[in-house]
């Protein structure tokens, strides 16, 4: 039986330019996590698996970077960048959980409320 | 250099059985899941079964299930796979194949025949 | 089960041409389909990755596309040692799944 929770940062904003860390946080659970992929739309981003560590895609390699965690940090933000995020946890023995953030990445003079999800 | 290799294979009657053994060198084998796959004699591949990198885990193709066992021994680096009730139709020869991040399959073994026939 | 259906079966083609094939599934897989080249008696050959990844050691001359439902393996320019069959693979899911295969032959 699956009784845990995934906790995201739900929806969220970020400067264009800028950067941002997606975050998941599964809980209520004693499964073992084995691997964490996160996806974009039908992109897959990363991967992080405990015994292999972070897999990031190569395509996105320049703008995606591991952690801190289980996160992921998404940098050099463009507006095509704006759009559903999901974090996918492979647990044992429960199963797969997912967690599901949206992103919208706009111009900075609008993007005030999502400057606390900033990196300095 | 990463290195898998099967034996195990043969000619065996229909209702028979066999152990397939893929030794693995070359990597931190408990650090990666595995599959076998297996191809008919003139056919394309078809997955048959699949193992975490601890073993806890495991998941098979309808066609094999109850019938084959997928196992593992990490302190020997060695994967296994137990045919029971073999068929005419198992007959193929059969891969064992590395799967990091249980994604893709980056290394495979040359392959062992297996026969099933009276 | 997810089918993965791919097209064409076979082809003939030159030395220096562009090939192109395709593979659908049954449902949207995300990015997870993986592309593998056999020759007669190999065992097969990983040459993409999770869509659009070229694995490491592969010639440049490949490349992948797609995501959810449609894919594309390319080969820029075809070399005589490209003459084999391609796969396309989907492990979004188990049972895990090849497509039918693709020969490409000399013409």
């Known amino acids: 039986m699956m009784t845990g929770t995934i906790e995201t940062t739900g929806n969220i904003s970020a400067e264009k330019g800028g950067s941002i860390i997606l975050q998941c946080h599964l809980s209520s659970t004693t499964a073992q996590v084995t691997q964490v992929n996160w996806e974009q739309q039908d992109q897959l981003l990363a991967i992080c698996n405990a015994d292999l560590g972070w897999h990031i895609s190569p395509s996105f390699k320049d703008r995606v970077a591991p952690g801190p965690g289980l996160g992921l940090t998404l940098q050099s933000l463009t507006v095509n960048d704006t759009g559903e995020y999901f974090c996918i946890y492979h647990t044992y023995p429960d199963g797969t959980y997912t967690g599901r953030i949206f992103l919208e990445v706009l111009e900075s003079s609008v993007a005030e409320h999502g400057a606390r999800f900033q990196i300095p | 250099e990463v290195q898998l290799l099967e034996s195990g294979g043969g000619l065996v009657q229909p209702g028979g059985s066999l152990r397939l053994s893929c030794a693995a060198s070359?990597?931190?084998?408990?650090?990666?899941?595995m599959h076998w796959v297996r191809q008919a004699p003139g056919k394309g591949l078809e997955w048959v079964s699949g193992?975490?990198?601890?073993?806890?885990?495991?998941s098979y193709a309808d066609s094999v299930k109850g019938r084959f066992t997928i196992s593992r021994d990490n302190s020997k680096n060695t994967l296994y796979l137990q045919m029971n009730s073999l068929r005419a139709e198992d007959t193929a020869v059969y891969y064992c194949?590395?799967?990091?991040?249980?994604?893709?399959?980056?290394?495979w073994g040359q392959g062992t025949l297996v026969t099933v026939s009276s | 089960d997810i089918q993965m259906t791919q097209s064409p079966s076979s082809l003939s083609a030159s030395v220096g041409d562009r090939v192109t094939i395709t593979c659908r599934a049954s449902?949207?897989?995300?990015?997870?389909l993986n592309w593998y080249q056999q020759k007669p008696g190999k065992a097969p050959k990983l040459l993409i990755y999770?869509?659009?990844s070229l694995q490491s050691g592969v010639p440049s001359r490949f490349s992948g596309s797609g995501s959810g439902t449609d894919f594309t393996l390319t080969i820029s320019s075809l070399q005589p040692e490209d003459f084999a069959t391609y796969y396309c693979?989907?492990?979004?899911?188990?049972?895990?799944?090849f497509g039918g295969g693709t020969k490409v032959e000399i013409k």
């Open positions: 194949a590395r799967v990091p991040y249980s994604v893709w399959a980056d290394y």
């Open positions: 070359g990597f931190t084998f408990s650090s990666y899941a």
């Open positions: 193992i975490s990198s601890n073993g806890g885990s495991t």
């Open positions: 449902q949207s897989i995300s990015s997870y």
């Open positions: 999770a869509a659009s």
């Open positions: 693979q989907q492990s979004y899911s188990t049972p895990l799944t």
